[in-house]
């Protein structure tokens, strides 16, 4: 039975041109995480696996920084960024917990984070 | 390019304990970074995931096979081996070493890329 | 754990022909699906994985489509080597599971 549940940054913002940290945490689980999944809609961005460390997708290798923790950092923020993001914490032996969190990146600098959300 | 050789007895007596060893060659597995994997196929049947190690020790296991199956890892060998104990004439197949996720550094992926030829196991009498 | 679907078990082809293999997971996998070719006495060998992306030295004529629980492997143009079994695995929580398989045939 899965009982975690995954709390995520929920709807943030950030300004064209700067960096956001996209961060997950599971909890109410005892189960392991073997690995995180980050995913923008059907794109992979990164892995971290718990054994082989971190793998950055080639096409993102320019923009995307592991961390800090099992987190993401984006960097050189485009208009073309804003929209969801996915980590998919792969847990043994529980299965799969995904989280969603929505970013905007504005023009403006006026970018202020949204609430804290949880996704069963 | 890594290579895999299984080793161990091809028959084994009801009740007993199945012991593989899989021998790497080509690169040291202290350094390695992907699983080391045992995966059988029972006569005219489909593959099963027994369990994969990872050097640091760090081991998974096929559920239904759980309270039967242990893998370890000798790094000062370059080998890994597989323990099945209990066996029946269920347990009779061919066992196969593999590595996964050789690739993953540059690629992101896991997947079973690199196969030993593998070696059959008569559980019998 | 996820459950692994393959069908059909056999698919009788002519070489030449175009060979469609479907493989069904009994929850979303994402893209981490393999699929594999093994010949009798040989041990499996890696086609693709990503669902999509052929592995080092597989020819064109293999190629690999879906995504979450339903794929699908296409062999494009059959030729006397492919006839073999082919399985699908998923790659994304352990326990890592394998479909049951799909035996192309000469026709």
């Known amino acids: 039975m899965m009982t975690g549940t995954i709390e995520t940054t929920g709807n943030i913002s950030a300004e064209k041109g700067g960096s956001i940290i996209l961060q997950c945490h599971l909890s109410s689980t005892t189960a392991q995480v073997t690995q995180v999944n980050w995913e923008q809609q059907d794109q992979l961005l990164a892995i971290c696996n718990a054994d082989l460390g971190w793998h950055i997708s080639p096409s993102f290798k320019d923009r995307v920084a592991p961390g800090p923790g099992l987190g993401l950092t984006l960097q050189s923020l485009t208009v073309n960024d804003t929209g969801e993001y996915f980590c998919i914490y792969h847990t043994y032996p529980d299965g799969t917990y995904t989280g969603r969190i929505f970013l905007e990146v504005l023009e403006s600098s006026v970018a202020e984070h949204g609430a804290r959300f949880q996704i069963p | 390019q890594l290579q895999l050789q299984e080793s161990g007895p091809g028959l084994v007596k009801p009740s007993e304990t199945l012991s593989l060893t899989c021998t790497v060659s080509?690169?040291?597995?202290?350094?390695?970074?992907?699983?080391l994997a045992w995966i059988r196929q029972p006569p005219g049947k489909g593959l099963e995931w027994i369990g994969s190690i990872f050097r640091s020790g760090s081991t998974y296991y096929n559920p239904s096979l759980e309270s039967r199956v242990t893998i370890s890892v000798d790094t000062s060998k370059n080998q890994f081996s597989l323990k099945l104990s209990s066996v029946t004439a269920a347990d009779t197949a061919v066992y196969y070493c593999?590595?996964?996720?050789?690739?993953?550094?540059?690629?992101?992926?896991?997947?079973?890329?690199?196969w030993g030829q593998g070696t059959t196991v008569t559980v019998s009498s | 754990e996820i459950v692994m679907t393959q069908s059909p078990a056999t698919l009788s082809v002519s070489p030449g022909e175009r060979a469609t293999l479907s493989c069904r997971a009994s929850?979303?996998?994402?893209?981490?699906l393999a699929w594999y070719q093994q010949k009798p006495g040989q041990a499996p060998r890696l086609l693709i994985y990503f669902a999509s992306t052929r592995a080092t030295g597989i020819p064109a004529r293999f190629s690999g489509s879906g995504s979450g629980t339903e794929f699908t492997l296409t062999i494009s143009s059959l030729q006397s080597e492919d006839f073999a079994v082919y399985y699908c695995q998923q790659t994304s929580p352990w326990p890592r599971t394998f479909g049951g398989g799909t035996k192309v045939e000469i026709k």
């Open positions: 080509g690169g040291s597995i202290s350094s390695g970074s992907y699983y």
């Open positions: 593999a590595i996964e996720g050789a690739n993953f550094k540059d690629f992101g992926y896991v997947a079973f890329d690199i």
């Open positions: 929850k979303s996998v994402s893209s981490n």
